[in-house]
């Protein structure tokens, strides 16, 4: 398969309260059942209607959950991760990694497990434009003196 997928990766702390419909989401992944190749992380696979996650609105399907109430989810068996959530109590703090797809192009291919960053030109172009605007403003300011 040709084509390149690039991602803007952001992290967020999401605090949820287990409501009458629970936290209301499902997970996949773990060291014994990898969801992404070369990545044993825990991912959100489904968000249920009327659950705390759906009502809050920030957690998205495909998000990677890094920690629960400060406890790291790295290198956990799937069932151990499930148990961690189920025993997390009423108030649950999630550290979450969102991956926003920012570009598709026919340049090579990155593996699913590579949380590759934003393309360099997408950083350089705005920086260059900002520099040019600042230089132009500076020159006009000098001319007025």
């Amino acid at each position: 398969m040709n084509g390149r997928v690039d991602y803007l990766v952001t992290e967020e702390e999401i605090n949820l309260t287990r409501g009458p419909s629970g936290l209301g989401f499902n997970i996949v992944g773990g060291t014994d059942q990898q969801y992404v190749s070369n990545d044993s992380g825990i991912y959100v696979s489904r968000i249920k209607e009327n659950g705390a996650a759906a009502l809050d609105g920030r957690l998205q399907e495909g998000d990677k959950i890094l920690s629960v109430n400060g406890q790291d989810l790295k290198n956990l068996l799937h069932q151990d991760a499930v148990d961690l959530f189920r025993n997390a109590g009423y108030a649950v703090s999630l550290r979450v990694q969102h991956r926003l797809q920012v570009q598709n192009g026919p340049i090579g291919h990155r593996g699913e497990g590579d949380p590759s960053g934003i393309p360099i030109f997408m950083v350089l172009v705005p920086v260059f434009a900002l520099t040019m605007v600042a230089a132009w403003a500076f020159m006009r300011y000098r001319q007025q003196l």
Partner: nanobody, 127 residues
Framework: EVQLVESGGGLVQAGGSLRLSCAAS????????MAWFRQSPGKERELVAD????????YYRDSVKGRFTISRDNAKNTVYLQMNGLKPEDTAVYYC?????????????????????WGQGTQVTVS
């Protein structure tokens, strides 16, 4: 195409035993667990027992604890429900189900919507 086929249902006297089987065909590599649900006339389908596909973790609803045993044979892609000490209130159509993820909520929140594949059901009648 994933298919779940149940067998082993039937008519049994109170106190008797039955063993239900559920044979899965098709790709099951991404399954996280399998379960048995039951539904009696006029009632909602309810989760009876669940077994994780890899870890051997099991769940039983309170009313069947100590009487029913869920087990799986990964090599045969088959899940079993051994039902002992059957009671008239166990009468229902029993459905096999498979899930491709796990709910993060306790079992009392888990229901039909957490399972992705279903069998056609097998009737269990306890007289």
């Amino acid at each position: 195409e994933v298919q779940l086929v149940e067998s082993g249902g039937g008519l049994v006297q109170a106190g008797g035993s039955l063993r239900l089987s559920c044979a899965a065909s098709g790709p099951s590599m991404n399954w996280y667990g399998m379960a048995w649900f039951r539904q009696s006339p006029g009632k909602e389908r309810e989760l009876v027992a669940d077994v994780s596909w890899s870890g051997g973790s099991t769940y039983y609803r309170d009313s069947v604890k100590g009487r029913f045993t869920i087990s799986r044979d990964n090599a045969k892609n088959t899940v079993y429900l051994q039902m002992n000490g059957l009671k008239p209130e166990d009468t229902a159509v029993y459905y096999c189900a498979a899930r491709t993820s796990s709910s993060v909520d306790p079992w009392n929140y888990v229901g039909v919507g957490d399972y992705d594949y279903w069998g056609q059901g097998t009737q269990v009648t306890v007289s």
